[in-house]
Interface confidence: low
């Protein structure tokens, strides 16, 4: 079989609330993937697992199923969306967040993202793992790529 | 029922190209891949490549690459080879074949053309 | 690139006869294989896909097979109309390869 390409885009969007008394960031994180099937049949978009990483900390799993069909030769663009919470022995990353005094809050966010696809009974794993700046003091749309945290080093918190 | 109706036969100079058709009926032109193998006279069939009518995306063995250009126009569901620099060798019955696509069946070409015969003479 | 070598490469049979075309794949292909008809005036046309799988309006007499990297097609009784070339066309992967092909000519 031919490859089965998979491009992490980056963060489309980022929505967050807070809970105050808790003093817990809420972050819905919005992903986006170009997968191209170079092959010469369809192949099934059989699941999408995500992961995103803070300060190597989990702080967000999603699993998406029976995603899509990619037909010959062709792309298709995949969001999926992860539920992050920065909480507990995070929580000092509140005052962070919810800091009045600077406009940008940005942290930096390991996206980990697998992709299992299926044709003629065989399964293919591809994963990727990328760093992305998130604003996590407000919601924010991104232009695609916008979001790259290009220090390829593990970022110190 | 499905169809896959070629154009005449092409007599044609050296050093020339010639683009030869394959008007598709009976069925959705975009849902299936187009297929061009290759025949010399009293030789087997060749496999030159595949264009996806739906995006116009196309692959090509790597005998052909520089040979043939494969396209398609999907408002006359219509699929193209041209063939560039032309030679003796590239005397040939050109196939077109139309392959479904599904994850259980794959690749199968279900459906030929009649052929499109190339001469290239001086 | 996937060689499928085709045997044989002419056979002489008789009406009615059983025959047996085989080709063999040099890397695995898995049930990726169609065998193909091609009449004297150059018209193809499919007889088997996915390695045992008869097409429709094919006759019964056609059938398909494989044991390990081995790919058969079976003609249970030659009919005149048969006698004309067989291909095997394998397409588990780029390229699509075919065998050389096989001539049946009536004996």
């Known amino acids: 079989p031919r490859s089965i390409d998979v491009k992490y885009i980056g963060v489309k969007s980022a929505y967050v609330s807070y809970d105050v008394q808790k003093r817990t960031i809420y972050l819905n994180i919005t992903n986006t993937l170009n997968i191209t099937n170079n092959n010469y049949y369809s192949v099934e978009v059989e699941n999408i697992t995500a992961q995103v990483q803070f300060s190597k900390t989990v702080i967000g799993k999603a699993r998406l199923n029976n995603i899509t069909i990619i037909g010959p030769l062709d792309m298709k663009q995949i969001d999926y969306t992860v539920p992050t919470v920065i909480a507990e022995e995070m929580s000092y990353m509140y005052d962070f967040c919810t800091l009045i005094s600077i406009k940008v809050h940005n942290i930096v966010l390991m996206m980990q993202v697998t992709v299992t696809t299926t044709y003629f009974g065989h399964s293919e794993q591809i994963s990727q793992e990328r760093y992305q700046y998130v604003d996590c003091g407000r919601n924010t749309t991104y232009q695609l790529g916008q979001s790259e945290y290009l220090n390829v080093l593990q970022p110190q918190q | 029922q499905v169809q896959l109706q070629q154009s005449g036969p092409e007599l044609v100079r050296p050093g020339t190209s010639v683009k030869v058709s394959c008007k598709a009926s009976?069925?959705?032109?975009?849902?299936?891949?187009i297929e061009w193998v290759k025949q010399r006279p009293g030789q087997g069939l060749e496999w030159i490549g595949v264009?996806?009518?739906?995006?116009?995306?196309?692959d090509y063995s790597e005998k052909f690459k520089d040979k043939a250009t494969l396209t398609a126009d999907k408002s006359s569901n219509t699929a193209y080879i041209q063939l560039s620099s032309l030679t003796s060798e590239d005397s040939a019955v050109y196939f077109c074949?139309?392959?479904?696509?599904?994850?259980?069946?794959?690749?199968?070409?279900?459906?030929w053309g009649q052929g499109t015969s190339v001469t290239v003479s001086s | 690139d996937i060689q499928m070598t085709q045997s044989p490469s002419s056979l002489s049979a008789s009406l009615g006869e059983r025959v047996s075309l085989t080709c063999r794949a040099s890397?695995?292909?898995?049930?990726?294989l169609n065998w193909l008809q091609q009449e004297p005036d150059g018209t193809i046309k499919r007889l088997i896909y996915?390695?045992?799988s008869l097409d429709s309006g094919v006759p019964k007499r056609f059938s398909g097979s494989r044991s390990g990297s081995d790919y058969s097609l079976t003609i249970s009784s030659l009919e005149s109309e048969d006698f004309v070339v067989y291909y095997c066309?394998?397409?588990?992967?780029?390229?699509?390869?075919f065998g050389g092909g096989t001539r049946l000519e009536i004996k």
């Open positions: 074949a139309r392959s479904p696509y599904s994850s259980y069946v794959g690749y199968a070409v279900d459906y």
């Open positions: 009976g069925y959705a032109f975009t849902n299936y891949l």
């Open positions: 264009i996806n009518p739906g995006g116009g995306n196309t």
């Open positions: 890397q695995d292909i898995g049930s990726n």
């Open positions: 996915a390695t045992s």
């Open positions: 066309l394998q397409y588990a992967s780029s390229p699509r390869t």
